[in-house]
């Protein structure tokens, strides 16, 4: 999906309301020095590229973000305002369906949701120059 | 506007299944999750689960251990809630509800359909 | 499950009066993330209170929320009419989304 149309400040509107709390309260506990980050993106629709793909699509040892408050809520607001984007994740979804069994926070996971905290930030601060 | 217009009254025996449908207008249909909420004779609201229409992906309240199955109809802008093996504490008013972003951008149910009542004896 | 206590379960207010709900939640949550619905007998919840403190559209000034973590509040400054009704908290923190047993404003 391209990102490129989306409603940007409203998005971010919507991340700095309620989904920003949504991931403190999942990783909290860890520390915020606890995991590096090490992936980045250079501007809005790369961020909202690198978010939907750290939320939605399961990796080796974390398989289980999708059903969580924050991803519900991205997942809301991606769709309300990114035209198309609902209809476009309607085969990703059918795709992912086994994977998303069983609940289970584990470090992959809490390593996983640090990354995409790093990457709302920079989603909220478009202008700042890539390190 | 938003309007979300539910099926009608349903009078069930024990065992059986119901399904209760919620016709949406106004809106983006497949971009917002669907909620069912119901409420037993003078009691409070009891959330059942919620849909996504764009991909038919779904949140159940395990307190329904497997009965409630909720489905969408985008050609028809309609999501439905079937609930099986029903028993007599299962008598109560259906409400849909749509979740979205407030003016505010907090998210909460913002439109709720005028509710369906469904009764369960033998 | 997140569970939501509210108290008193009725209030018996005399019109013009101030009438003050309180919303208990089970563990902490962001106040961003504790709404309230008003109900009238034989109709549908209506969204009033989002995000703790933000009146929905069309909702009067005599209404305010606060809080925060574990304690909620709704507060009616001077109660009119239409404001006799049940009015429930709930949470969008965590599935099962959890809704408080109600309280019922009547009056006195």
């Known amino acids: 999906y391209d990102f490129t149309n989306c409603d940007f400040e409203k998005i971010k509107a919507a991340y700095l309301s309620t989904i920003s709390k949504d991931l403190i309260t999942y990783m909290s506990g860890t520390k915020s020095t606890e995991f590096n980050n090490t992936v980045s993106c250079s501007n809005r629709p790369h961020c909202l590229t690198e978010i939907q793909s750290l939320t939605f699509n399961p990796t080796a040892g974390c398989a289980s973000l999708a059903k969580e408050m924050f991803a519900m809520k991205t997942k809301a607001a991606l769709a309300i305002w990114c035209p198309g984007y609902s209809e476009t994740q309607i085969n990703a979804t059918q795709a992912m369906k086994k994977a998303r069994k069983s609940k289970v926070t584990t470090n992959k996971c809490l390593e996983q949701v640090s990354q995409l905290q790093g990457l709302w930030r920079r989603f909220n601060r478009p202008l700042l120059k890539q390190q | 506007q938003v309007q979300l217009v539910q099926s009608g009254a349903e009078v069930k025996k024990p065992g059986a299944s119901v399904k209760v449908s919620c016709k949406s207008s106004?809106?983006?249909?497949?971009?917002?999750?669907m909620n069912w909420v119901r409420q037993a004779p003078g009691q409070g609201l009891e959330w059942m689960g919620q849909i996504f229409p764009g991909d038919g992906d779904t949140t159940y309240n395990g307190n329904f251990k497997g009965r409630v199955t909720m489905t969408r109809d985008t050609s028809t802008s309609t999501v439905y809630m079937e609930l099986s093996s029903l028993r007599s504490e299962d008598t109560a008013v259906y409400y849909c509800?749509?979740?979205?972003?407030?003016?505010?951008?907090?998210?909460?149910?913002?439109?709720w359909g005028q509710g369906t009542t469904v009764t369960v004896s033998s | 499950e997140i569970v939501m206590t509210q108290s008193p379960a009725t209030l018996s207010v005399s019109p013009g009066e101030r009438a003050t709900l309180s919303c208990s939640v089970s563990s902490s949550i962001s106040s961003s993330n504790l709404h309230w619905y008003q109900q009238k007998p034989g109709q549908s919840p209506r969204p009033w209170i989002f995000g703790t403190s933000n009146l929905a559209s069309g909702i009067p000034a005599r209404f305010s929320g606060s809080g925060s973590g574990t304690e909620f509040t709704l507060t009616i400054s001077s109660l009119q009419s239409e404001d006799f009704a049940v009015y429930y908290c709930q949470q969008w923190s965590s599935y099962p989304l959890t809704f408080g047993g109600g309280t019922k404003v009547e009056i006195k």
């Open positions: 509800a749509r979740s979205g972003f407030d003016y505010g951008y907090f998210y909460a149910m913002d439109y």
């Open positions: 106004g809106y983006a249909f497949s971009s917002y999750w």
